[in-house]
C-alpha cells in the first residue's frame, strides 16, 4: 500500500512511460513468497530486478525483463530487433550497492558506475540487487569488460544467477532469516537459459498442495512435485509442456553447436 | 528525523463533523502511503482509513465508510481526515501513521476525539 | 473480516522469557509486525516481517511465525518492557490488528 521509495527529493525524468503504471514504485505485497519479477524504474528509465512477495502489490510487475521493456520502455521493440552491436553492461551493474536486510557478513563485488570500476562491498546474505559478485573476476568479466555473447538477449546467463543475492535456493536461517547458500547447479557453459531453471523444487513455505512442475536440469525432463501455495520459486508451472516450453531451449548438447531450440 | 504531529481533536456532539490534520516532517513526504489508526479509550487498536502517496486510491474501515474522507495536501506536507456524522463510538484517540511496505514504521502522538452530547 | 487473535494478558518474572503469540488464519502465507505501547504513549514497531527488528530495538526482542501462529518473544524481560504490545498484518489492502495482549513484569 505504500509507495515505497527512496528518501529523496529527485523529480522524476522527463521521459513519459507508456502506462500510467509503469511509474509506480517496486511494490513487493505483503505476502513471503520470493519470486524474482521485474518493474520499471522511473529515476533510472530501466527495468530492474526486485522480489515480489506473491500476493496484492501493484501492476508493475512482469515476470520477465522482456515483458517489463515492452510493456515500459517506449520504443523498445523498434530498438531490440537492431542487431546488438559489441557488447553491452547489463542493467543491474548500474544498480546501487545494496547490502540487503540481513546480517551476514560476506564479502562481495560490485561494479561503481562512478568510478567505472569493481569494488568490494559487504553483503548481509539476503535480498539486496543483481550488482553483487563472488569474485572480482566475474564482476569485471561482466560489467567492466563484458564480452560480446551469442546468447538469447535479455536471457540472463548463470553467472548473474550464481551471485544473485535476491535468490533463495538452499535455505539455511541467520537470526530467523532466509539466507541464500550457493546452489548447486550444472557449471555455466552447460546450460544457457532462463537461471531459474536450474534451481531446485521447492515446495515452498504454505499448507496447500497443488500440483507443480519443475525442471531437472540433471535430467533434462521436467518432473511433477507438490506445491504448497508460496514462496518457493521460479521453477515451477502449471503444466509440463509450460516448463518445457521455458526450460528445456537453454541446454547446450554441444559448445560448438550453441543453443538447442 | 521523522515527526507526525496531529491537531484538530475535541469535544464535539453526536451527528457533528471534525476535521483532523496530520503534518509531517523529516520525510518525503508524497512518496509515503499515510494511515489514521484510533485506540478508543481502554481498547486495542483500530485502523480507520489509508491513502496510497502521490496516487489517489484511499481505503476505509467499514465503521467509517461513507462518514470519514482522508486525504493530503503535498505542497505542505500534511494529511487530514474529515469526519462528519460523528458518533459516540468514534470516541477516541486519533493516531497518524506512516505506512512502510505494509506495516506502520513512525506514529504521531495522537489527538482525542470526544463525541458526546 | 479477518481475526487475529491475541491472550489479552501474559505475566513474567524479571529475567524470565516472555512469549505473547498471534493466530490467524493468514498467518503462513502473510507476514506478522509487533508494536509496543506504553501508557499514553503512541505504539512503536518493535518486529517488522515477522522477525526483524528495527535499529534502537534492543536484542532481546525476537519474533518468529510459523503455521497459523506468530509469536514475540522478550528474553530477560525487563521492568521497562511491560506495555501492551499488537501484531499487525495485511489484507487485501488493509491492515488488521489482533486485540493486544497487556504484559505484567511481576515484583
Known amino acids: 500500500l505504500s509507495e515505497e521509495a527512496d528518501d529523496t527529493d529527485s523529480e522524476l525524468g522527463s521521459m513519459k512511460p507508456l502506462h500510467t503504471f509503469c511509474a509506480m514504485k517496486a511494490d513487493d505485497g505483503p505476502c513471503k513468497a520470493m519470486i524474482r519479477s521485474y518493474f520499471f524504474n522511473m529515476y533510472t528509465h530501466q527495468c530492474e530486478e526486485f522480489i515480489y512477495g506473491g500476493c496484492e502489490g501493484n501492476e508493475n510487475r512482469f515476470d520477465t525483463l522482456e515483458e517489463c521493456k515492452k510493456t515500459c520502455i517506449p520504443g523498445y521493440e523498434k530498438t531490440a530487433v537492431k542487431a546488438a552491436s559489441g557488447a553491452e553492461r547489463p542493467d543491474f551493474c548500474f544498480l546501487e550497492e545494496d547490502p540487503g536486510l540481513c546480517r551476514g557478513y560476506m564479502k562481495r563485488y560490485l561494479y561503481n558506475n562512478q568510478t567505472k570500476q569493481c569494488e568490494r562491498f559487504v553483503y548481509g546474505g539476503c535480498l539486496g540487487n543483481r550488482n553483487n559478485f563472488e569474485t572480482l573476476d566475474e564482476c569485471k568479466k561482466i560489467c567492466e569488460n563484458p564480452v560480446h555473447s551469442p546468447s538469447p538477449v535479455n536471457e540472463v546467463q548463470m553467472s548473474d544467477y550464481v551471485t544473485d543475492g535476491n535468490t533463495v535456493t538452499d535455505r539455511s536461517t541467520v537470526n530467523n532469516i532466509v539466507v541464500p547458500q550457493s546452489p548447486k547447479v550444472p557449471r555455466r557453459r552447460d546450460y544457457r537459459g532462463r537461471p531459474w531453471c536450474l534451481q531446485p523444487a521447492d515446495s515452498g513455505l504454505c499448507k496447500a498442495s497443488e500440483r507443480r512442475f519443475y525442471y531437472n536440469s540433471a535430467t533434462g525432463k521436467c518432473h511433477r512435485f507438490n506445491y504448497t501455495g508460496c514462496g518457493g520459486n521460479n521453477n515451477n508451472f502449471t503444466t509440463r509442456r509450460r516448463c518445457l516450453r521455458s526450460c528445456k531451449t537453454g541446454l547446450i548438447k554441444n559448445k560448438s553447436k550453441g543453443v538447442v531450440k | 528525523q521523522v515527526q507526525l504531529v496531529e491537531s484538530g481533536g475535541g469535544l464535539v456532539q453526536p451527528g457533528g463533523s471534525l476535521r483532523l490534520s496530520c503534518a509531517a516532517s523529516?520525510?518525503?513526504?508524497?512518496?509515503?502511503?499515510m494511515s489514521w489508526v484510533r485506540q478508543a479509550p481502554g481498547k486495542g487498536l483500530e485502523w480507520v482509513s489509508s491513502?496510497?502517496?502521490?496516487?489517489?486510491?484511499?481505503y476505509y474501515a467499514d465503521s467509517v465508510k461513507g462518514r470519514f474522507t482522508i486525504s493530503r495536501d503535498n505542497s505542505k506536507n500534511t494529511l487530514y481526515l474529515q469526519m462528519n456524522s460523528l458518533r459516540a463510538e468514534d470516541t477516541a484517540v486519533y493516531y497518524c501513521a506512516r505506512v512502510y511496505r505494509y506495516w506502520f514504521d513512525y506514529w504521531g502522538q495522537g489527538t482525542l476525539v470526544t463525541v458526546s452530547s | 473480516s479477518y481475526e487475529l487473535t491475541q491472550p489479552p494478558s501474559v505475566s513474567v518474572s524479571p529475567g524470565q522469557t516472555a512469549r505473547i503469540t498471534c493466530s490467524g488464519d493468514n498467518l503462513p502465507k502473510y507476514y506478522a509486525h509487533w508494536y509496543q505501547q506504553k501508557p499514553g504513549q503512541a505504539p512503536v514497531v518493535v518486529i517488522f516481517r515477522d522477525s526483524n527488528r528495527p535499529s534502537g530495538i534492543p536484542e532481546r526482542f525476537s519474533g518468529s511465525n510459523s503455521g497459523n501462529t506468530a509469536t514475540l518473544t522478550i528474553s530477560g524481560t525487563q521492568a521497562m518492557d511491560e506495555a501492551d504490545y499488537y501484531c499487525q498484518s495485511w489484507l487485501s489492502g488493509t491492515p488488521w490488528f489482533g486485540g493486544g495482549t497487556k504484559l505484567t513484569v511481576l515484583g
Open positions: 523529516g520525510f518525503t513526504f508524497r512518496v509515503y502511503g
Open positions: 491513502d496510497r502517496g502521490s496516487r489517489s486510491s484511499t
